[in-house]
């Protein structure tokens, strides 16, 4: 397992939420991604292929997530303080094997510009 | 100095059974991906087997269910159990250090990049 | 599965002249997982280039890889009577994990 910051932008704020980039190799047929607040698990995308390279996607631990070719966005809204902490991509590579193990992330600063319902 | 060490080859009949043995040196054995590669005389090159550093096994089509790499980190040993086997199966087993990195969105393949010198396993009647 | 052909089968040529070996993939690979070995009779075969075009340590600089897609080339600027062997295209895939081509024969006309 390697363990590192993100070398790209990985929160981007919108409309008093965030968006946690995490992407992931484009040589990567079938994953785990696990959005990890600290040690605890938020959020899970799993991407299978079936016969006939049909893609399966699942997850046990339900975001709203978005899927592309080479990362997955996880969404966060009504952000308050409590948010900040550090957020980490725990991406699980089935195929291509052998399996793999690697953790990407980087600490979430929320200021007040960012928060979702500022007192007037 | 890297380097992988082969035996226990040698001629065994048509549904008997043999296990190689590999000894690396001279580098951290735990964090490399094995395989082992074979090439029957005057043939190409035919990847066999592989064993993840996770422990977890893959094998090519024509040995699944009589081939079985394993590993022992302890011991810094790659081994492969051959059962059942075959007249086909008569070629030179190679051990194999697999270099691959992950990090984060990238993935490097560095290629297979140290061999034993081979182990010779004939079976024949 | 992936398919690598390589060709020609076999390659004449003479010491100072220029090798152009050829590994043609079934349908298209990454640059990344791309390899090339040598191996010489008797011996082990030995890594030349990885990641399509980068040189393994120790191999020197008349070896060069490039390609993209389904066609890659081994290219030996001019021949040293050392480098007369067979070379082989590998590729990291899903399944099998490991596939190589069949090899090209450089031999000595």
């Known amino acids: 397992e390697i363990n590192g910051s993100a070398n790209y932008e990985m929160f981007i704020f919108h409309n008093g939420g965030v968006q946690i980039l995490c992407k992931y190799p484009d040589i990567v047929q079938q994953f785990k991604m696990q959005l990890l607040k600290g040690g605890q698990i938020l959020c899970d995308l799993t991407k299978t292929k079936g016969s006939g390279n049909t893609v399966s996607i699942k997850s046990l631990k339900f975001c709203h997530s978005q899927l592309s070719n080479n990362s997955v966005s996880f969404f966060l809204y009504n952000l308050d303080h409590s948010h900040a902490n550090y957020y980490f991509c725990n991406l699980s590579i089935f195929d291509p094997p052998p399996f793999k193990v690697t953790l990407t992330g980087g600490y979430l600063h929320i200021y007040e510009s960012q928060l979702c319902c500022q007192l007037k | 100095e890297v380097q992988l060490v082969e035996s226990g080859g040698g001629l065994v009949q048509p549904g008997g059974s043999l296990r190689l043995s590999c000894a690396a040196s001279?580098?951290?054995?735990?964090?490399?991906?094995m395989h082992w590669v074979r090439q029957a005389t005057g043939k190409g090159l035919e990847w066999v087997a592989l064993?993840?550093?996770?422990?977890?096994?893959y094998y090519s089509d024509s040995v699944k269910g009589r081939l079985t790499i394993s590993r022992e980190n302890a011991k810094k040993s790659l081994y492969l159990q051959m059962n059942s086997l075959r007249v086909g199966d008569t070629a030179v087993y190679y051990c194999?250090?697999?270099?691959?990195?992950?990090?984060?969105?990238?993935?490097?393949?560095?290629?297979?990049?140290?061999w034993g010198q081979g182990t010779t396993v004939t079976v024949s009647s | 599965e992936i398919v690598l052909t390589q060709s020609p089968g076999t390659l004449s040529l003479s010491p100072g002249e220029r090798a152009t070996l050829s590994c043609r993939a079934s349908?298209?690979?990454?640059?990344?997982?791309l390899v090339w070995y040598q191996q010489k009779p008797g011996q082990a075969p030995r890594l030349l280039i990885y990641?399509?075009?980068t040189r393994a340590t120790g191999i020197p600089d008349r070896f060069s890889g490039s390609g993209s897609g389904t066609d890659f080339t081994l290219t030996i600027s001019r021949l040293e009577p050392e480098d007369f062997a067979v070379y082989y295209c590998?590729?990291?895939?899903?399944?099998?994990?490991?596939?190589f081509g069949q090899g090209t024969r450089l031999e000595i006309k």
């Open positions: 349908q298209s690979v990454s640059t990344s997982s």
């Open positions: 990641g399509a075009s």
């Open positions: 064993i993840g550093t996770a422990g977890d096994t």
């Open positions: 590998q590729q990291f895939g899903s399944s099998p994990p490991i596939t």
């Open positions: 194999v250090r697999d270099r691959r990195a992950v990090a984060g969105h990238y993935y490097y393949f560095y290629g297979l990049d140290v």
């Open positions: 001279g580098f951290t054995f735990n964090g490399y991906d």
